[in-house]
Interface confidence: low
């Protein structure tokens, strides 16, 4: 029996075309993705193939301004058309809370959502009830599959779950459930979740009747033979783990943003054991048209976008520097106010222990790309920001040692006067240079600020200690010479979109004046 | 109803710049590439370039790419093309045109200005 | 870039008859099921008016008189029972790949 698996993960709100690099589509007949392009893809494969599953790994939400305006509604009314039948949890389903998953997405899906490792408690424990799952039997032809759900237990210091949701460990989780399944006679097992290639795997080899693994968080292109675009193949694909019990089980995943649609077609044998499995992601290109319903669609809920864009969405009384000649040579504000949104987007229910798991940021100056007038009557507006974080990024979290942010800090000066992008700017850092020493040893002081303490104040960095750090994905990609952040970093959680969290934060302050306070100070 | 209504005549010398400008009502400025558009006198038309004033992304003739310049004011819905260098041969009429659809689907010019005629001479 | 051909040069017709004016691309400007050319007419002291889009579709406040066909290189614009107000300059323009290009013009005089 033949089963073709079509799976996506970590769309993050890009439900238009897209550029190859998945910012915004400028030249369509250049374009990717969206979904009247995949909707045209899925199509096809349901019509040519008897057995199709169409499943969406997680992190539907966040990315793009769609999400901003229409905050998982849009997830709720394309998946529903495009009809998906499962989609798992991913961290970013929580960033407006639990309220801003159960009302747009979990009460309108006509698809299961799926999570087993997620426990609700107190008064949410009923209010959330049957809207998510830990797993779904589904019919396909005439046999059943059984999918069942994990989400990352870092969640609740990469998003907002709140503190009734408890995420437990993926494969302590996900045993009890697979087991109940073997004991309703199904057979054939897809783990369908969102917690990244090196825990797809550990849950491919650990956990008892798992046919096959479909995964997202990582962002991990797979791909066997000439991978058609730009993305370099982290593994074949399938990647094929043995398990502890001795299985071959193929672990996929789709890279991002909707580029490609995975694409795996597994074949069992009448005891549900898997016989063989084989495919490639599809890149999702111009070659294939946008199917025009949904084209029709998407540009019917684009409008309310576009007035979106113009609306005011705060007020700032001072000039918000933002120009090439401060940020690249000096602390400025602009620096200051992306880094105190970024962190202030990364407040997290704490322990007593600490009052926040983060507390730094470092920002490439190269990537301000613009001030911000206060003279037009201070009114600071999504088009604004988008001329000032122009290039759709994110603000991601990583664990890197203190002698990497030390190295990071000596690379934000080593060619310093040349108006270059790689300056650092910084929140919860006091750094101090001095010029006249050679590159590589021009950090005279870099002190942080403290985590683990209930009134925060700035101590020395420690070289051995790991320390978490929001950034742009930029820099966690290595870019603007930041090799060192690339090859040492310890961790790695994508974030929310820049210009999402700038404008949050000037919604939720209303009135900003950020000042340039000596953050960063020449000896 | 949409609007393209663009700055009047211009007589420049050899050498001289040239900014024409083209004010659009009736629309959702920020949503729709604006196109620039030249015909020279008893000629055919000639793609100049383009801009999305929403992120200010443009696209360049190769042809022009040196002497051009095209840029929007989000306040004002106006949209500027700037042309260096000026030689005789660059008299013409220039059009601004906005492309219809909501994404960049087509690209089709579906309202056009009523043209600038650039007179260029010693 | 791609260069757009129009023939003829000049169509001279009576009210009534039937205009067929072909553009052909240097190379395909379709891709699966899309056809990125388009048709527009000019007349003198005027800007050009959008006939058709994608090869086939009537741009609304065209009459149903204009039509367009074709597909990959070869596209044709059809004026059916043509009348005295439709003598112009009719131009197609591709929008396939960058730079857009312009076919260079079809004159059409009616007698």
């Known amino acids: 029996w033949e089963l073709t698996i079509l799976h996506t993960n970590d769309v993050h709100s890009r439900l238009e075309q897209t550029s190859e690099d998945s910012s915004k589509c400028v030249n369509a007949s250049r374009c990717m993705g969206g979904v009247a392009r995949l909707f045209t893809k899925v199509q096809q494969i349901r019509r040519a193939e008897p057995n199709v599953l169409l499943l969406d790994a997680g992190d539907q939400y966040q990315g793009t301004i769609w999400f901003t305006v229409y905050k998982g509604a849009e997830v709720a009314h394309f998946m529903n058309a495009l009809r998906y039948d499962a989609m798992a949890l991913g961290n970013h389903e929580f960033d407006n809370g639990v309220e801003g998953l159960i009302e747009p997405l979990l009460k309108e899906a006509k698809f299961p959502i799926l999570s087993a490792n997620i426990k609700a408690k107190g008064p949410l424990a009923s209010q959330i009830s049957g809207l998510y799952l830990p797993y779904k039997v589904l019919p396909v032809g005439d046999e059943v599959v059984g999918i069942v759900g994990y989400t990352s237990k870092e969640t609740p210091f990469l998003s907002n779950p709140g503190t009734n949701l408890v995420f437990e460990d993926e494969i302590t989780a996900l045993q009890p459930e697979v087991d109940k399944l073997k004991t309703l006679n199904v057979n054939k097992i897809i783990a369908l979740g969102h917690s990244g290639f090196e825990t797809d795997k550990l849950i491919a080899q650990k956990v008892r009747g798992v046919d096959v693994v479909v995964g997202g968080h990582s962002n991990t292109f797979l791909y066997t033979g000439n991978p058609p675009s730009k993305e370099v193949p982290a593994g074949k694909y399938p990647f094929i783990v043995t398990s502890d019990d001795g299985r071959k089980v193929p672990v996929v995943q789709a890279y991002a943003f909707g580029k490609y649609l995975g694409y795996l077609k597994i074949e069992f044998d009448e005891r549900g054991n898997v016989i063989s499995s084989h495919g490639n992601p599809i890149l999702l290109n111009s070659s294939i048209p946008e199917d025009p319903s949904i084209k029709a669609d998407i540009n019917k809920w684009r409008i309310k976008l576009d007035n979106y864009s113009t609306q005011e969405l705060g007020k700032t009384i001072v000039y918000l520097d933002g120009s090439s000649q401060s940020c690249r040579f000096r602390e400025c504000n602009m620096g200051n106010l992306i880094c105190d949104a970024m962190i202030n987007n990364n407040l997290r229910h704490a322990d007593e222990m600490f009052w926040n798991h983060v507390s730094m940021c470092i920002l490439n100056g190269g990537g301000i790309r613009s001030p911000i007038d206060e003279r037009n009557n201070g009114t600071i507006t999504w088009e604004n920001l988008a001329a000032v974080l122009p290039f759709g990024g994110t603000f991601d979290l990583v664990q890197l040692k203190g002698s990497t942010l030390k190295k990071a800090f000596e690379h934000s000066v080593h060619r310093y006067g040349q108006s270059t992008g790689e300056f650092l700017q910084v929140g919860g850092i006091h750094v101090v240079y001095d010029l006249s020493r050679k590159p590589g040893d021009r950090v005279v002081k870099l002190d942080v600020l403290c985590t683990k303490c209930r009134v925060p104040s700035y101590d020395p960095l420690k070289m051995d200690e790991i320390y978490k750090v929001i950034l742009p994905n930029f820099l966690a990609n290595g870019g603007d010479g930041f090799q060192m952040i690339k090859d040492e970093l310890l961790r790695h959680d994508s974030g929310d979109q820049d210009i999402n969290v700038v404008s949050t934060y000037i919604s939720k302050m209303k009135v900003i004046y950020p000042a340039v306070e000596g953050r960063i100070k020449f000896s | 109803q949409v609007q393209l209504v663009q700055s009047g005549a211009e007589v420049e010398k050899p050498g001289a710049s040239v900014k024409v400008s083209c004010k659009a009502s009736g629309y959702t400025f920020t949503s729709y590439w604006i196109t620039w558009v030249r015909q020279a006198p008893g000629q055919g038309l000639e793609w100049m370039g383009d801009i999305y004033p929403g992120s200010g992304n443009t696209n360049y003739n190769e042809k022009f790419k040196t002497r051009v310049t095209i840029t929007a004011d989000k306040s004002t819905s106006t949209a500027y093309m700037e042309l260096s260098s000026l030689r005789s041969e660059d008299t013409a009429v220039y059009y601004c045109?906005?492309?219809?659809?909501?994404?960049?689907?087509?690209?089709?010019?579906?309202?056009w200005g009523q043209g600038t005629l650039v007179t260029v001479s010693s | 870039e791609i260069v757009l051909t129009q023939s003829p040069a000049t169509l001279s017709l009576s009210p009534g008859e039937r205009a067929t004016l072909s553009c052909r691309a240097s190379k395909n400007v379709s891709t699966s099921g899309y056809s990125y050319m388009h048709w527009y007419q000019q007349k003198p002291g005027q800007a050009p008016r959008l006939l058709i889009y994608l090869a086939s579709n009537l741009e609304s406040g065209i009459p149903p008189r204009f039509s367009g066909s074709g597909y990959g290189t070869d596209f044709t614009l059809t004026i059916n029972n043509i009348e005295s107000e439709d003598a112009a300059y009719y131009f197609c323009?591709?929008?396939?790949?960058?730079?857009?290009?312009f076919g260079q013009g079809t004159k059409v005089e009616i007698k």
């Open positions: 323009q591709h929008s396939r790949e960058l730079p857009f290009t």
């Open positions: 045109a906005k492309e219809g659809g909501l994404t960049t689907e087509d690209y089709a010019l579906d309202y």
